[in-house]
C-alpha cells in the first residue's frame, strides 16, 4: 500500500503447492471405474494446482487392478505442464480385480525410491483412489502399517459409483478405505457419490495436501 493508501501490489492467496513434496497417486484402474475420463479430469484439476519441478513438488502415478503399472515416476517430468500432458494420456488398464494392498505396497516399495525420484528428507504423500473393496484386504493392515513406519501421509478417496449403480451397501467399503487414510481420518478421507463427482473434492484435497508443508 502506498503512503496515500493506494493498492500498489496485491498478492493472491496461496492456492498452489509451491513447497517440496513427493506425491504418488495410486489409481484403481479396474473396469468398474466409469467413465475413466472423470479420473483424468480429477487428475488434471488437482495437478494444475501444483508447482511441479525437481526442487518443488514431484508427482508420480501408479495404476493398479489385478497388477500394478508405474504410469510415470516422481522424477519423470520437471514441470506442471509436462505432468498435465502425461496424466491426460493415462489409459485405463481394466480388469475385474482390485488389489488395493498390492497397489499401495508397490507405491511404497517402488514409487517412493530414490531410483524413481524420491528425495531424502522430503515429505511423502500418497493419494489412493478406488471404487471397491480390495481383493487382498487381508494384507491391508500390514501394508498401511508399513506406510506409517515410513512416514507416508495417506489420503484415500472412496468412489461409491459402482455400489450406487448396483444398489449395494457401501458400509464395509467405506470402512476399508477409511482405514487406509492417515489420522485424523476426517482430514484424510473423502468419499464421492460417483466418478463424475471426483472433481468436486479437488479444492479441499489440494488444500489439505498443501497444508502438510505449511
Amino acid at each position: 500500500v502506498s503512503p496515500t493508501f493506494q493498492v500498489v501490489n496485491s498478492i493472491a492467496p496461496v492456492q498452489e503447492c509451491s513447497t517440496q513434496l513427493d506425491i504418488v497417486i495410486v489409481l484403481d484402474g479396474s473396469n468398474s471405474i466409469y467413465p475413466w475420463d472423470s479420473v483424468t479430469a480429477f487428475l488434471n484439476d488437482l495437478l494444475e494446482r501444483m508447482d511441479i519441478g525437481p526442487k518443488q513438488t514431484q508427482v508420480g502415478i501408479v495404476q493398479y487392478g489385478a497388477n500394478v503399472t508405474h504410469e510415470f515416476n516422481l522424477n519423470k517430468y520437471s514441470s506442471t505442464e509436462e505432468v498435465l500432458v502425461a496424466a491426460k494420456k493415462i489409459v485405463q488398464r481394466g480388469g475385474r480385480q482390485t488389489m488395493t494392498a498390492l497397489g499401495i505396497d508397490t507405491a511404497r516399495k517402488e514409487a517412493f525410491t530414490e531410483a524413481r525420484g524420491a528425495r531424502r528428507g522430503v515429505k511423502k504423500v500418497m493419494v489412493i483412489v478406488t471404487d471397491g473393496e480390495s481383493h487382498d484386504n487381508h494384507r491391508l493392515k500390514k501394508v498401511i502399517q508399513d506406510c506409517e513406519d515410513e512416514n507416508i501421509q495417506r489420503f484415500s478417496i472412496a468412489i461409491l459409483g459402482s455400489y450406487n449403480r448396483g444398489n449395494l451397501s457401501t458400509e464395509k467399503f467405506v470402512e476399508e478405505i477409511k482405514s487406509i487414510a492417515s489420522e485424523p481420518t476426517e482430514k484424510h478421507f473423502f468419499n464421492v457419490s460417483d466418478e463424475l463427482a471426483l472433481v468436486t473434492i479437488v479444492k479441499t484435497l489440494g488444500e489439505r495436501i498443501f497444508a502438510l508443508e505449511a
Epitope: S30, N31, S32, Y34, P35, W36, G65, A66, Q92, R93, G94, G95, R96, S162, R165, G166, L168, D194, L196
Partner: antibody
C-alpha cells in the same frame, strides 16, 4: 492401437452350425468385456450378449438367450459367437465391440468404444 | 426394457447446416448413460458421444450431446460432407444395452 479383427463372411444353409470370431489386439484383451451386436439387412443395431475373456463370464440379452453361444479363448485373445442350427432369419451383419465399462455384481454399464469390421452371415 | 425412439427418421440437410437429432427413452436413463454412434454404409458403427455429452477420442467438436432423464439430443453444428450417415442412440443404464432405430442424415 486397439483393434478388433473379425473372421470373414460366411454363407451357410439352414440347420448348419457356425462359429465366427473376433480377435483383439493393442490392449489387454483379458481385461475388457467384449460384446456382440446384430444388424439385420437394412435394420438397426441389437445387442446380443457380452463376455469377459479373462474368465469367460457371459451375459445374454433375453432375446438371444438360448439362440446363440458366446465363448472366448483368452490364450489367443479371441471371442466367439456360435450357432448350433442356423435359420434364414440369422442372416445379418454381426459386430463385436469392446466395452468401456463393467458388468459385475448384476449391474452392467458402459459404452462400446472400439468395433470390429463386422462379419456378414448369409443363411439360405 | 427401455425403448429408445429417435426422431426424425430422416433429416434432409445441406452441408454447413445445423443438424439436431432427438432420442427419447420410455423411462429415465440412469446416470445419463446414453451414447451416440455414427454408421456409414458398409462400415461398423463409430462411437461419437458417451454419458450423454462427452465426446469420444478424435471426434470433432462440431458434434455435441446433451440431455438427461428421458430426452437426449445430438447436435452437429455445421454439417460436413462426411457427416451424412445413420446415427444411433444407445442406453446402457439397465444391465442391458438397447439402441434407437436410427436417424438418417441425408444430403438435401
Amino acid at each position: 492401437e486397439v483393434q478388433l479383427v473379425q473372421s470373414g463372411a460366411e454363407v451357410k444353409k439352414p440347420g448348419e452350425s457356425l462359429r465366427i470370431s473376433c480377435k483383439g489386439s493393442g490392449y489387454s484383451v483379458t481385461s475388457y468385456w467384449i460384446g456382440w451386436v446384430r444388424q439385420m439387412p437394412g435394420k438397426g443395431l441389437e445387442w446380443m450378449g457380452i463376455i469377459y475373456p479373462g474368465d469367460s463370464d457371459t451375459r445374454y440379452s433375453p432375446s438371444f438367450q438360448g439362440q446363440v453361444t458366446i465363448s472366448a479363448d483368452k490364450s489367443i485373445s479371441t471371442a466367439y459367437l456360435q450357432w448350433s442350427s442356423l435359420k434364414a432369419s440369422d442372416t445379418a451383419m454381426y459386430y463385436c465391440a469392446r466395452l468401456q465399462g463393467d458388468c459385475s455384481g448384476g449391474t452392467c454399464y458402459g459404452h462400446f468404444d472400439y468395433w470390429g469390421q463386422g462379419t456378414l452371415v448369409t443363411v439360405s | 426394457e427401455i425403448v429408445l425412439t429417435q426422431s426424425p427418421g430422416t433429416l434432409s440437410l445441406s452441408p454447413g447446416e445445423r443438424a439436431t437429432l432427438s432420442c427419447r427413452a420410455s423411462q429415465s436413463v440412469s446416470s445419463s448413460y446414453l451414447a451416440w454412434y455414427q454408421q456409414k454404409p458398409a462400415q461398423a458403427p463409430r462411437l461419437l458421444i458417451y454419458v450423454a455429452s462427452r465426446r469420444a477420442t478424435g471426434i470433432p467438436d462440431r458434434f455435441s450431446g446433451s440431455g438427461s432423464g428421458t430426452d437426449f439430443t445430438l447436435t452437429i453444428s455445421r454439417l460436413e460432407p462426411e457427416d451424412f450417415a445413420v446415427y444411433y442412440c444407445q442406453q446402457y443404464g439397465t444391465s442391458s444395452w438397447t439402441f434407437g432405430q436410427g436417424t438418417t442424415v441425408e444430403i438435401k
